[in-house]
Interface confidence: low
Amino acid sequence: LPKAPVITTPLETVDALVEEVATFMCAVESYPQPEISWTRNKILIKLFDTRYSIRENGQLLTILSVEDSDDGIYCCTANNGVGGAVESCGALQVKMKPKITRPPINVKIIEGLKAVLPCTTMGNPKPSVSWIKGDSPLRENSRIAVLESGSLRIHNVQKEDAGQYRCVAKNSLGTAYSKVVKLEVEVFARILRAPESHNVTFGSFVTLHCTATGIPVPTITWIENGNAVSSGSIQESVKDRVIDSRLQLFITKPGLYTCIATNKHGEKFSTAKAAATISIAEWSKPQKDNKGYCAQYRGEVCNAVLAKDALVFLNTSYADPEEAQELLVHTAWNELKVVSPVCRPAAEALLCNHIFQECSPGVVPTPIPICREYCLAVKELFCAKEWLVMEEKTHRGLYRSEMHLLSVPECSKLPSMHWDPTACARLPHLDYNKENLKTFPPMTSSKPSVDIPNLPSSSSSSFSVSPTYSMT
């Protein structure tokens, strides 16, 4: 007898893993044999679709390799022309081991900013995401949170957040690990110890200290009155991300010294600055009432110029007179390397006898200045061209320090040997007579500003001019 279709085994919810097989059974009793069709989400499944296998006269639907997109409601409909068609439906829940679809990547971040390490996952049941830092589970706190997406968000990143991270996605079917990524925390350059200001005597040695830190370790540069420091000695050491820079200075003038710490973050730089002032006690250039003492010259620079065992005036306005005066000569001497062979010996004699003046011992040791005539001989005969250039530089402010002023006396302010032959010192190296002048370069002025006498040789007089008279 004809019998309308009856579904004896209603469809049930099927759980299936990705890439595995899933089967729906729709057992039907009827006569004659029914036609059975299958739908997914109300869309007919075609018999020739190779992803499916339909067997047992349509009663078994098999998905051969389940995909994530196969999730949905599957219905079977049976119809044999007797009575109405019957339908049964069931859900396919695609179960999936956790999979990390967007893994974290290495991140460089500046301290204080927000870092987000992505970790997007797939899986059914939905995986829970946790994070590991180094060897240990990462604990969330007010700054560190695992977002709903699985990403790790770190507010106000700190140095201690740096390290190796990986995310872990876990559900009842398994666990997936991301690769290990590095969070590098960069820190703006910061000065830990600023250089200190000093009030010192002229010719003192001062060490300015500047300590800075940052990630990467910063570099330190020094600026003197707006210009990069080229003189002085800079010593640096780096330990535990801290750079220590020491600038050693010989003080010949007041100045503003700035320590600049710089480090690089990608294409950008961060800098930190700290400044110190160097002031000179009673700075008015060396005074006429300079005090000092007589001592034998023990230096090196002027050995060939000063008379053997010359008694020279050492100025106690310097912290270390011998060292300071020797350094002044040395600095000025270096500038003489570029002068002509005619000028150099005369300039060296003037320089040494000007800074290491002949000393008159007594109750009050007194420096004896160079005689004006010898000074003018150097200025207007031996070194005429060089003197002009030097004076021009002085007026244009091209000298970095007042050192050159100590090495070049103002001839007009020196005593003349005609006034009092004992009041000034002679330069034995400039022993010549007027007849020899023809061999010198032409004078820059039409006539010397003073008559140049025959300069007597003097084995006893060693040459010295006090800074007392040398400054303009």
Partner: antibody
Framework: EVQLVESGGGLVQPGGSLRLSCAAS????????IHWVRQAPGKGLEWVAS????????YYADSVKGRFTISADTSKNTAYLQMNSLRAEDTAVYYC?????????????????WGQGTLVTVSS | DIQMTQSPSSLSASVGDRVTITCRAS??????VAWYQQKPGKAPKLLIY???SLYSGVPSRFSGSRSGTDFTLTISSLQPEDFATYYC??????????FGQGTKVEIK
């Protein structure tokens, strides 16, 4: 394909030194933990040393502490075991192995890849 | 240090037999226990991790379980290729590992 290849084994006199290498391919050392495990002839497995993924931590079995040093060169993707003051009881096949995952959180994943081993014989 | 006492040290069994190997930890440990199979002249192979999880590619006849400080490796139906030595191993700290003495499974 993940592979670990040990080298550097050989015959050495007691008190001598050897340096074993473990060249890794198919994964980067920096993201893994590498372990050295040895097996004396006819005996069981004995864990020797390990170096953690960040290379900031090294661990040693008491029997080798102070004599062996584990290290890694990430640029060469190679781990090393420097063995000094060798004794007869250090004679063994030395294996290097990779720890799957990152230790035992959220589950201990075991040593999933092993090298073929290199024989160290300490004898006079 | 935590000791892993493995028993038996050897056993004889036939193909198709159910084989059980036990490891007892000297003190309470986490589930950080793995089981390895080693054949003569070869490196060990990972079978079970986290006490009871089957490593990929390992036949399902191998299983692991835990009861307190006792850890068990079971081979439900011994196959010819399963004759080998089996080791348990625990990790009580990140990188400090201890192996059991091993169990040699021989053909009866």
């Amino acid at each position: 394909e993940v592979q670990l290849v040990e080298s550097g084994g050989g015959l050495v006199q007691p008190g001598g030194s050897l340096r074993l290498s473990c060249a890794a391919s198919g994964f980067t050392l920096y993201s893994s933990s590498i372990h050295w495990v040895r097996q004396a002839p006819g005996k069981g497995l004995e864990w020797v040393a390990s170096i953690s993924s960040s290379y900031s931590s090294t661990y040693y079995a008491d029997s080798v502490k102070g004599r062996f040093t584990i290290s890694a060169d990430t640029s060469k993707n190679t781990a090393y075991l420097q063995m000094n003051s060798l004794r007869a009881e250090d004679t063994a096949v030395y294996y290097c192995a990779r720890l799957a995952g990152l230790y035992h959180y959220p589950g201990y994943l075991g040593l999933d890849y092993w090298g073929q081993g290199t024989l160290v014989t300490v004898s006079s | 240090d935590i000791q892993m006492t493995q028993s038996p040290s050897s056993l004889s069994a036939s193909v198709g037999d159910r084989v059980t190997i036990t490891c007892r930890a000297s003190q309470s440990v986490s589930s950080a226990v793995a089981w390895y199979q080693q054949k003569p002249g070869k490196a060990p192979k990972l079978l079970i991790y986290s006490a009871s999880s089957l490593y990929s590619g390992v036949p399902s006849r191998f299983s692991g379980s835990r009861s307190g400080t006792d850890f068990t490796l079971t081979i439900s139906s011994l196959q010819p290729e399963d004759f080998a030595t089996y080791y348990c191993q625990q990790s009580s700290r990140s990188s400090l590992l201890t192996f059991g003495q091993g169990t040699k499974v021989e053909i009866k």
